[in-house]
Amino acid sequence: QGGAAEGVQIQIIYFNLETVQVTWNASKYSRTNLTFHYRFNGDEAYDQCTNYLLQEGHTSGCLLDAEQRDDILYFSIRNGTHPVFTASRWMVYYLKPSSPKHVRFSWHQDAVTVTCSDLSYGDLLYEVQYRSPFDTEWQSKQENTCNVTIEGLDAEKCYSFWVRVKAMEDVYGPDTYPSDWSEVTCWQRGEIRDACAETPTPPKPKLSK
C-alpha cells in the first residue's frame, strides 16, 4: 500500500466509502508526533488532521470524513515542516465495506436463505460461512446480492452461520479489506439456538420395532 519513504510505511482503510483511515509506521520517528496534512482536490491548500490516532502517546494515524464516495486523497505526513511521506491515492482501492446489517434466515426443509440489507453501492460479494460441529472447517457460499441460499443441509444438525461483505477484486483491486463478520447465529431444525454443541452429539439409537 505505501512504499517506504524515509522508512515510513502507510496503511489506508476506506470504511464503507465514508471514512478514511491512514496509519503510519515510522521507526525513525517512533517518538515523534508526526502531523498529517491532506486535501481531496489537488488545487486546494492542505488541511491538517483534526482526528489523530495515537499509539503510546504519539500520533500514528488520522481519521477523515470523505467529501464524496470516490475521490483522490492527497496527503503529506510531516515532521514539523519537513515532509517524510507525500502521496496521492484513489481511496476506493482500499475499501472496507461495513458489516452486514439486518441478517435474516428463512428455512425451508434442507435449505436456508440468508438475507441482509444490501449496501448502497455495488460490485460486492456477500459471503455466508457455515458449519456444524461435525465439520472440520467452514463451508462458504457467496452471491452478488445479500440473498444467499444454501441447500443440502441436515435438518437434525446444528449449524453456525456468519456473514461478511467483500469488494470484488476485478473492480476494486487486491488491496481492499473484507467487512467484519456479522455475529454468529446458530440454528437447528429451523429454530435459533444459543450455541451449537462443540462436540457432536452421538446419533440416537434406533428403537427396534
Epitope: 470516490d70 496521492s88 476506493v92 453501492y121 460490485d123
Partner: antibody, heavy 117, light 106 residues
C-alpha cells in the same frame, strides 16, 4: 446491465455551440464519477472532462478548459457536455463513460460531432 | 499532466506469437495504469487496471506488468480476435491516454 446512450451530436459550424447528453441506466448514477472521452477520426483517445459523484467537482484538460462544461442531473440520471466556441479540431466521436477509481469502466456507443463550415 | 508514449506504434505479429506492448510515462505513474483494447468501429474495452488486474471476462493470455514510469501489456499467445489497437491510460496525475499501438496480422 450498464447502459450509456449518448445523443445530441451532429454537424455544427466553427464558433457555435452544441450540447451532448448521455442517459445512464443499470447502475446507481449518483455513486459514480462520469467522464467524456473523445476520438478524432483515425486518431487516438483523448480525455475531455470528468465530474465527481456527489460534489459535482469538474476536471478538464487544457485543450477544452473554458470552452466545455460537464454537468449532471441526478434526478434524470443524465450526463451533459456543453461545448461552446467549437473548433474543427473538436471533430470527434464523443463517448460517455461510467468511471470508478479514475478509470472509465463502461462506455456508451459514442456520438459523432463534426465542426465544419 | 503526465505524457504517455507507446511503442511500437504498429506491430505486425502472427497467430500464436507472444506479443509485448510498451507504455512509458513522463513521470512516475504509481501503478495507476490501465490498458484498453479497441476494435474498428467499436468503443474501447477495459482489459487491465492498476497495472496488472484483469477485468472479468478478459482471457488469461492478457497480462500487465510494470512500475514507476515503465509498463507492459503482454499477450502470451496471439489470437485472431486480439487484432486491435491498444491504449494505455494513466490516472495518477490527471488523466491521459497513450497514442496507441495498432496490432495487425503479419
Amino acid at each position: 446491465e450498464v447502459q450509456l446512450v449518448e445523443s445530441g451530436g451532429g454537424l455544427v459550424q466553427p464558433g457555435r455551440s452544441l450540447r451532448l447528453s448521455c442517459v445512464a441506466s443499470g447502475f446507481t448514477f449518483n455513486n459514480y464519477w462520469m467522464t467524456w472521452v473523445r476520438q478524432a477520426p483515425g486518431k487516438g483517445l483523448e480525455w475531455v472532462a470528468s465530474i465527481t459523484d456527489t460534489s459535482g467537482r469538474t476536471y478538464y484538460p487544457d485543450s477544452v478548459k473554458g470552452r466545455f462544461t460537464i454537468s449532471r442531473d441526478h434526478a434524470k440520471s443524465t450526463l451533459y457536455l456543453q461545448m461552446n466556441s467549437l473548433r474543427p479540431e473538436d471533430t470527434a466521436t464523443y463517448y460517455c463513460t461510467k468511471t470508478l477509481g479514475g478509470i472509465p469502466r463502461d462506455w456508451g456507443q459514442g456520438v459523432m460531432v463534426t465542426v465544419s463550415s | 499532466n503526465i505524457q504517455l508514449t507507446q511503442s511500437p506504434s504498429l506491430l505486425s505479429a502472427s497467430v500464436g506469437d507472444r506479443v509485448t506492448l510498451s507504455c512509458k510515462g513522463s513521470q512516475n505513474i504509481n501503478n495507476y495504469l490501465a490498458w484498453y483494447q479497441q476494435k474498428l468501429g467499436e468503443a474501447p474495452k477495459l482489459l487491465i487496471f492498476k497495472t496488472n488486474i484483469l477485468q472479468t471476462g478478459i482471457p488469461l493470455r492478457f497480462s500487465g506488468s510494470g512500475s514507476g514510469t515503465d509498463y507492459t501489456l503482454t499477450i502470451s499467445s496471439l489470437h485472431c480476435e486480439d487484432l486491435a489497437t491498444y491504449y494505455c491510460y494513466q490516472f495518477n496525475n490527471g488523466f491521459t491516454f497513450g497514442p496507441g499501438t495498432k496490432l495487425e496480422l503479419k
